[in-house]
């Protein structure tokens, strides 16, 4: 997960945009990535970075938990 996020974040050269990406990686079981992104007011660049990293992180976590379930069988 960390490697993939670092790969994505590396393309954001504006520090705030990069940090928006990292914010998206934080675990939040109560809201979707879209719901969380809707509260961002600093600009579309932040929304885009947050959403991309949030979605990728969610997918990777889902894949990992799916693998864990398979291993547990």
């Amino acid at each position: 997960l960390q490697e993939k996020i670092e790969e994505i974040a590396a393309k954001y050269k504006h520090l705030v945009v990069k940090k928006c990406c990292y914010d998206g990686v934080r675990i939040n079981h109560d809201e979707t990535c879209e719901q969380r992104a809707a509260r961002i007011s600093v600009g579309p660049r932040c929304v885009k970075a947050f959403t991309e990293c949030c979605v990728v992180a969610s997918q990777l976590r889902a894949n990992n938990s799916h693998k864990d379930l398979q291993l547990g069988r």
Epitope: K13, H14, L15, V16, V17, S41, V42, G43, P44, C46
Partner: antibody, heavy 118, light 111 residues
Framework: QVQLVQSGAEVKKPGSSVKVSCKAS????????IHWMRQAPGQGLEWMGY????????NYNENFKGRVTITADKSTSTAYMELSSLRSEDTAVYYC???????????WGQGTTVTVSS | DIVLTQSPASLAVSPGQRATITCKAS??????????MNWYQQKPGQPPKLLIY???NLDSGVPARFSGSGSGTDFTLTINPVEAEDTANYYC?????????FGGGTKVEIK
């Protein structure tokens, strides 16, 4: 209407520090990044750094080698720029500006003249 | 860091003529089709004022005689026709990455 109002002119001795304030009004302070630039007499604009008040995130121009510190007080909607170890070359007009959409500076403070002289 | 080179350093133009200022970036300021290049006007004793953002978008209240063009590394600010009140310094600025950088400026004088 959006306004950035800066503190008044300062005269400082070499080796001392200066702290310039930038009070924002007319918009939600935490929604936008505040940048600081300076302009030496007859020279161009030099970017110093910024703060995102909502999160406290900062970034600085490495040319200032740790001499600059930017802070923000959300309760008063005020950003501050402190420059230490002042030298004569730091004599300049210092500006704060709001960055809109992480793209461009749409509002600027009126500027604060800092003179460093022994 | 992205270095922005403006040319010419100064120019004198007659009223009604065209003034053209160029800004060359040391690397592309385009990100996913969006050019993070802006232009500002600064008159003596005043802070800079936004003219053009995203290479070609005129800020509100800016006269239509100002226009911006370009992409990637090469950008142009055009004033056509020039008026007496356009005497000022003009700066390009990139915001695609930190540190934000400015061009060295172009002084426009009216003949």
């Amino acid at each position: 209407q959006v306004q950035l109002v800066q503190s008044g002119a300062e005269v400082k001795k070499p080796g001392s520090s200066v702290k310039v304030s930038c009070k924002a009004s007319g918009y939600t302070f935490t929604d936008h990044i505040i940048h600081w630039m300076r302009q030496a007499p007859g020279q161009g604009l030099e970017w110093m750094g910024y703060i995102y008040p909502r999160e406290g995130w900062t970034n600085y121009n490495e040319n200032f080698k740790g001499r600059v510190t930017i802070t923000a007080d959300k309760s008063t909607s005020t950003a501050y720029m402190e420059l230490s170890s002042l030298r004569s070359e730091d004599t300049a007009v210092y500006y704060c500006a709001r960055e809109r959409n992480l793209e461009y500076f749409d509002y600027w403070g009126q500027g604060t003249t800092v003179t460093v002289s022994s | 860091d992205i270095v922005l080179t403006q040319s010419p350093a100064s120019l004198a133009v007659s009223p009604g003529q065209r003034a053209t200022i160029t800004c060359k970036a040391s690397q592309s300021v385009d990100y996913e089709g969006f050019n993070y290049m802006n232009w500002y006007q600064q008159k003596p004793g005043q802070p800079p004022k936004l003219l053009i953002y995203a290479a070609s978008n005129l800020d509100s209240g800016v006269p239509a005689r100002f226009s911006g063009s370009g992409s990637g590394t090469d950008f142009t600010l055009t004033i056509n026709p020039v008026e007496a009140e356009d005497t000022a310094n003009y700066y390009c600025q990139q915001s695609v990455e930190d540190p934000h950088t400015f061009g060295g400026g172009t002084k426009v004088e009216i003949k």
